[in-house]
């Protein structure tokens, strides 16, 4: 008694799919696999499978039903913090080869990595033009002042909303400042915060107001403190710089914008006699803090003559180092002062219109404003390395 | 709470113009595409036209192409639709609403009556 | 365009029962990781009411009795117990292709 395998029903591809081998007949024992097109996917139910081969039965059946090819579908695009995503193959399309554009807000807000425009691959990502997977950056625009420019010298004015909107008024301990660097991070002087350094969260970060008493601002937390290793308290203050990050992204607007960091050029606007701008809630000449944020314009003064100023007592040799800048009127009258530290030395980058900080308010005479004396700041060109590194370490 | 409000409906002579107006509040209105759909009398839902969220895109039912146009103050939260040339079939309830993926929050409507 | 019909065009169902309303695509709404089909609730005079989205997940602050299914070209709701409330029309909507197209509806009333 003999008996014959009956052969299999051809096996028809399906849709998107092709089988391979191609016989003209399949018997006992024989497979084929499907393979699908590139962007397609296949599936048995709604099980993705890796792979799929079927063989053919002594009863003349296949093993395994056929599966389909189902088109890739990249799923809804993460949203982008200050920025939006838009379906450019149309509404909420976001299988194989849809596109997608991601910006950021308008204003306060440019993108980095790349262009935003993603495009749904037949790995099932979102890939961008330069084959990224992951989410382009929308970051602070920095700089952004409703002054146009700083101008004469003119100096105790009470600013106007949106003319420093990088301005961060400091409590806990003592009243201090800070400007807003990108929107996550304060820089300030060591000495302001160096009492916080191990307790990070004593301190009250205030932003986006002008009133030092006022209500309504933007609160901010601090999540560590980083001083300058090689800032020592109470022994000058050489390396006057800290950096603080906050524990979550402030929402970027007219009245809280960062400050830039300076540009390899940027001291091409820092020569003796050009003018920075500091503001501050500190001392005023009536003795007190002020109650409305101030500013003074001030002209940058010759390194040799305010190392000189800072020779004699009581001051000890060496008070002004390299790490430092002066500003002030060798006739007095306009300065920063005690409550001001911290706060950020302004200069207008004339060909990006931009404002970076070139100084952190660190230091002075023992009364605000003294003929023959300056302010001292600390040079925030020397310490861009360390500022990098500790943003991008952290 | 999130809302859309229409307005803008009312009586048009066939061939004439209409302006409709969806403002929205609640929401982040630049992060969300937005439609129109419509509903005749006693008939069933037509999507008529979507705009992305920053204006990007715009897509429409064939039976307005040319006619219809879909826009958007994003700074105003507010959603247009400009309907010129209309005809006695664009006789219907508007509505405006929210989503990419689907139609996820809708306004009250506005009508809009072609007639002569 | 797709076209979706939808089955059947009116029921009235027993307060308590189950009610099963079909959608059938002219072709298919579903990718490997989700079907872009729709439902929605729409009572007299008032704008209509998303029930379901991708054919089965339930949307936030619907009753529990709402429930889909479906893949492909074939798709379902179900409302189990039917309440009094429940009276409505009920349109299914694609979302796979522009244009955007909804299915005829299924007026529901409750005996």
């Known amino acids: 008694y003999t008996s014959t395998a009956q052969p299999c029903p051809y096996p028809m591809a399906p849709p998107n799919g092709h089988v391979s081998p191609v016989q003209a007949k399949y018997i006992l024992k024989d497979s084929f696999s499907i393979f699908c097109e590139t962007g397609y996917e296949l599936l048995q139910g709604h099980l993705p499978l890796k792979s799929f081969t079927a063989v053919c039965q002594k009863d003349g059946s296949w093993d395994r039903p056929m599966p389909a090819c189902s088109i890739v579908d990249c799923g809804p695009p993460d949203d982008l913090p200050s920025g939006r995503v838009e379906y450019i193959t149309g509404p909420g399309v976001t299988t194989y080869k849809a596109v997608i554009q991601y910006s950021c807000e308008e204003t306060f807000y440019t993108m980095k990595v790349n262009d935003g425009k993603y495009v749904c691959e037949a790995d099932g990502f979102w890939t961008s033009s330069k084959g990224e997977k992951s989410l382009p950056v929308c970051e602070p625009v920095c700089g952004l002042s409703a002054r146009t420019t700083g101008g004469r010298i003119y100096g105790g004015q009470k600013a106007k909303p949106g003319d420093f909107p990088w301005q961060v008024l400091i409590l806990g301990g003592t009243t201090a400042a800070g400007a807003l660097l990108y929107d996550n991070w304060v820089l300030t002087a060591a000495h302001a915060v160096y009492e916080q350094k191990h307790d990070a969260s004593a301190l009250d970060i205030r932003m986006g107001t002008l009133k030092r008493l006022s209500p309504h601002y933007t609160q901010a937390w601090s999540e560590a403190v980083f001083i300058h290793e090689g800032y020592t308290h109470d022994a000058g203050f050489d390396n006057d710089i800290a950096l603080i990050k906050l524990n979550n992204k402030v929402v970027i607007n007219s009245n809280i914008t960062p400050i830039c960091l300076p540009r390899k050029e940027a001291e091409s606007f820092m020569r003796t006699d050009d003018i920075g701008t500091a503001s501050g809630w500190g001392l005023t000449q009536r003795g007190f803090l002020a109650r409305n944020l101030m500013y003074v314009d001030i002209p940058i003064v010759d390194h040799q003559k305010c190392t000189a100023a800072y020779e004699k007592p009581p001051y000890p040799r060496g008070s002004v180092t390299a790490n430092m800048l002066c500003a002030g009127l060798e006739s007095g009258g306009k300065d920063s002062c005690r409550g001001d530290s911290g706060g950020a030395l302004v200069f207008l980058d004339s060909e990006t219109e931009r404002w970076f900080v070139g100084g952190i308010v660190s230091w002075g005479s023992m009364n605000c404003g003294e003929a023959g004396q300056y302010g001292v700041y600390t040079k925030v060109i020397n310490y861009i390395p360390w500022i990098e590194n500790i943003i991008s370490d952290f | 709470d999130v809302q859309l409000v229409e307005s803008g409906g009312g009586l048009v002579q066939p061939g004439g113009s209409r302006k409709l107006s969806c403002v929205a509040s609640?929401?982040?209105?630049?992060?969300?595409?937005m439609h129109w759909v419509r509903q005749a009398p006693e008939k069933g839902l037509e999507w008529v036209a979507y705009i992305s969220s920053g204006s990007s895109s715009s897509f429409y039912v064939d039976t307005v192409k040319g006619r219809f146009t879909i826009s958007r103050d994003n700074p105003k939260n507010t959603l247009f639709l400009q309907m010129t040339s209309l005809r006695s079939e664009d006789t219907a309830m508007y509505y405006c609403a929210r989503g990419d993926r689907n139609f996820e929050v809708w306004g009250a409507g506005t009508t809009v009556t072609v007639s002569s | 365009d797709i076209v979706l019909t939808q089955s059947p065009a009116s029921l009235a169902v027993s307060l308590g029962q189950r009610a099963t309303i079909s959608c059938r695509a002219s072709q298919s709404v579903s990718s490997s990781r989700y079907s872009y089909m729709h439902w929605f609730q729409q009572k007299p005079g008032q704008p209509p009411n998303l029930l379901i989205k991708?054919?089965?997940n339930l949307e936030s602050g619907v009753p529990a009795r709402f429930s889909g299914s479906g893949s492909g070209t074939d798709f379902t709701l179900n409302i189990h117990p039917v309440e009094e409330e429940d009276t409505a029309t009920y349109y299914c909507q694609q979302s796979w292709e522009v244009p955007w197209t909804f299915g005829g509806g299924t007026k529901l009333e409750i005996k």
């Open positions: 991708h054919a089965s």
């Open positions: 609640g929401f982040t209105f630049s992060s969300f595409g």
